[in-house]
Amino acid sequence: SELDTPKDLQVSETAETSLTLLWKTPLAKFDRYRLNYSLPTGQWVGVQLPRNTTSYVLRGLEPGQEYNVLLTAEKGRHKSKPARVKASTEQAPELENLTVTEVGWDGLRLNWTAADQAYEHFIIQVQEANKVEAARNLTVPGSLRAVDIPGLKAATPYTVSIYGVIQGYRTPVLSAEASTGETPNLGEVVVAEVGWDALKLNWTAPEGAYEYFFIQVQEADTVEAAQNLTVPGGLRSTDLPGLKAATHYTITIRGVTQDFSTTPLSVEVLTEEVPDMGNLTVTEVSWDALRLNWTTPDGTYDQFTIQVQEADQVEEAHNLTVPGSLRSMEIPGLRAGTPYTVTLHGEVRGHSTRPLAVEVVTEDLPQLGDLAVSEVGWDGLRLNWTAADNAYEHFVIQVQEVNKVEAAQNLTLPGSLRAVDIPGLEAATPYRVSIYGVIRGYRTPVLSAEASTAKEPEIGNLNVSDITPESFNLSWMATDGIFETFTIEIIDSNRLLETVEYNISGAERTAHISGLPPSTDFIVYLSGLAPSIRTKTISATATTEALPLLENLTISDINPYGFTVSWMASENAFDSFLVTVVDSGKLLDPQEFTLSGTQRKLELRGLITGIGYEVMVSGFTQGHQTKPLRAEIVTEAMGSPKEVIFSDITENSATVSWRAPTAQVESFRITYVPITGGTPSMVTVDGTKTQTRLVKLIPGVEYLVSIIAMKGFEESEPVSGSFTTA
């Protein structure tokens, strides 16, 4: 019997290079399937499949082609009628728009368009247009749409082609043509600066063309190895240090990329001579010194050695060593009117340069001039004269009384002086003074002048003024400009105190004497001390005033928040009072109150309850402060009861009421007594009470009642009042 045809043969999935087939198994028994499908070329391909197969994928097909498929069941030599189906593969996505977007001298950039996520990879072929030599192949991922093709020859035409690969299938090839650009060249190279051990090289080049520049520095005419340097491609200038002085160099520069180096540019240069010290000059010349100046680059030498030699003399030269930072030097100690040769050596770590030399003649000796007597005293004179600076070793001055032939007085003075005081002369006497200078044993001509001393100095008119309890002022008269000091002695008339002595400047004509006891008689002695003389002593008397009285510091009306301070003082004795309140623990800032000299009490409020205070009161008179009076007080002390009121008064009784103080108290004690006298009666009530009944009184008698608050051992100030029984 005939075999059943496979049932329901159909194409379930189509792709660009595959078709998926499905079918159902026939009822009759069979051994296998035979699957045949046609290729676009007309050929047929056959595949044998196991009997249990119900699907199959045809792979490796071409996109966009129609395929005929026949499926037959076979048993032995028997075949069923074929099941047939026709299907087409999907159209392949297009690869298009191949363009060369950037052209460099050694590479190109390719761009193309293609469907997204379609391709496994692209194959790009690059070939010189006019050459048959092997093309260069590049495989790039299917996700790319552009690629750089480096490593090409400059100024060369290229053919570039591309195809995509999809599951082994190649798309049609796209091609494009492009030529690479001309090789970029270095521009010009110049030596911008030349030194003796370095130079600066500048060059031009296209921006971004080179990764780096390779510079070679070669000594001309030597086989010595060149000095090589590489500098970044962004630079157009570099310093070349460490060269030899006065040497010919050939410098070459190349631009370098990964696989290309430009033709080198060269430049020749001669470095400068080593900078020697130069311009040794003498800028200032005096009779015994000169100033040298010289030039040299900074940092060249550690130090300089200067040699100073008298010309035409064989005696040893004078050597000086100075720091390498100096460019100038003063050479002192030379002879006047003398030719010198000065040489200068530079030095580096002990190595000495060849010398520079200069010749110079010092000036002639200076002269003294203008001797004058500028000040005349009673026992001395002041001389002034002029002379060249730093010229003289010393001066010799001779002083002689004009009308006497006795030996003259000689003085030797340092050469730096231009004035001197001549002491120890007689008052009101004419003198002749002469002077000469000495320079290394040589004496200048003598200069002379005449002058008379003044009369002897005097003091007088010793006055006492501005007497206070502890001080007074002195004033006196004295000859001006003579006295060095005045001595003042203060002695009390009763000789109970030690003598006090003051030495004060001779320029003063007043003195303030303080620190004296009040109400004391003093004798003041004054004498003046001038060079070689003490004047006769003059005297005056003085009595210090009595000290104003400040006494009886009293604290009253103590309550939790304050108290009243009062004191006694002499009338009109004080300008002001200072009251200072300090807590005993010194935890708070002191409070100061300045009161006028007429006040005698101060009410203090706003203090802290339950702490101790120290109160100090001092008086001020003419700026002087008395020693303070002191008292201590505690604000916890009881506040006094207030506002005593009497009511319900009968012949032998009455009710007394009061207002309790702010702070809590334990009890109140009420004392009452007839005003005319007698034994006081007393009653104590609980601290919470504010009234009590007074009984057993005498009719028609005035009673004085006083109430105090009590707490422990403390008692308040009393509050009082009076009433009369009926």
Partner: antibody
């Protein structure tokens, strides 16, 4: 009497480090510049490095620049040469020498041998 | 190569005068210093500056300078003068430079 005594030489592998010391006596160490000079076996003298009296200025030969460091401790009267990244061509006797004003390299130590070899 | 150039070897008959020379650019500006080194010993300064001898150096040693050349002269060479002689100066970068050295042989 001026005395200079080098120490710290020895055998070291290429790329290794060594520190030479030079103990000085008989002069005010802080007032004088000092130098290191080396001499390869059978070869001439080669200046290596110098330092000013205070230690504030240092100088190096191109062949050792960046690898060697000269220093001095004036409180210990000692000169040092720290040698890093040593090469076979650094093999030499290393001398320390004193410099006086106007007198270069006036006193030398007896030297210490440094051998750089694998 | 060294910045100071010396003849590698010089010989002199005992008692005769010999001159050892040293050439280099830095000698136009600086005086050379001269060092004597005997085998196995440290160098010893023999001449510095224009023509100065440290104490203990015999007066048969002298120095001179002209242009870019410095000379060490030994007048009446002695057997103990046989040694290597090195010249030394300062270059433009303030670094010390030594000549390659001259081996002096005294022939008896």
């Amino acid at each position: 009497e001026v005395q200079l005594l080098e120490s710290g030489g020895g055998l070291v592998q290429p790329g290794g480090s060594l520190r030479l010391s030079c103990a000085a006596s008989g002069f005010t160490f802080s007032s004088y510049a000092m130098s290191w000079v080396r001499q390869a076996p059978g070869k001439g003298l080669e200046w290596v490095s110098a330092i000013s009296g205070s230690g504030g200025s240092t100088y190096y030969a191109d062949s050792v620049k960046g690898r060697f460091t000269i220093s001095k401790d004036n409180s210990k009267n000692t000169l040092y040469l720290q040698m890093n990244s040593l090469r076979a061509e650094d093999t030499a006797v290393y001398y320390c020498a004193k410099t006086s004003p106007r007198v270069p390299l006036d006193y030398w130590g007896q030297g210490t041998l440094v051998t750089v070899s694998s | 190569s060294s910045e100071l150039t010396q003849d590698p070897a010089v010989s002199v008959a005992l008692g005769q005068t010999v001159r050892v020379t040293c050439q280099g650019d830095s000698l136009r500006s600086y005086y050379a210093s001269w060092y004597q080194q005997k085998p196995g010993q440290a160098p010893v300064l023999v001449i510095y500056g224009k023509n100065n001898r440290p104490s203990g150096i015999p007066d048969r040693f002298s120095g001179s300078s002209s242009g870019n050349t410095a000379s060490l002269t030994i007048t009446g060479a002695q057997a103990e003068d046989e040694a290597d002689y090195y010249c030394n100066s300062i270059n433009s970068t303030r670094n010390e430079v030594f000549g390659g050295g001259t081996k002096l042989t005294v022939l008896s």
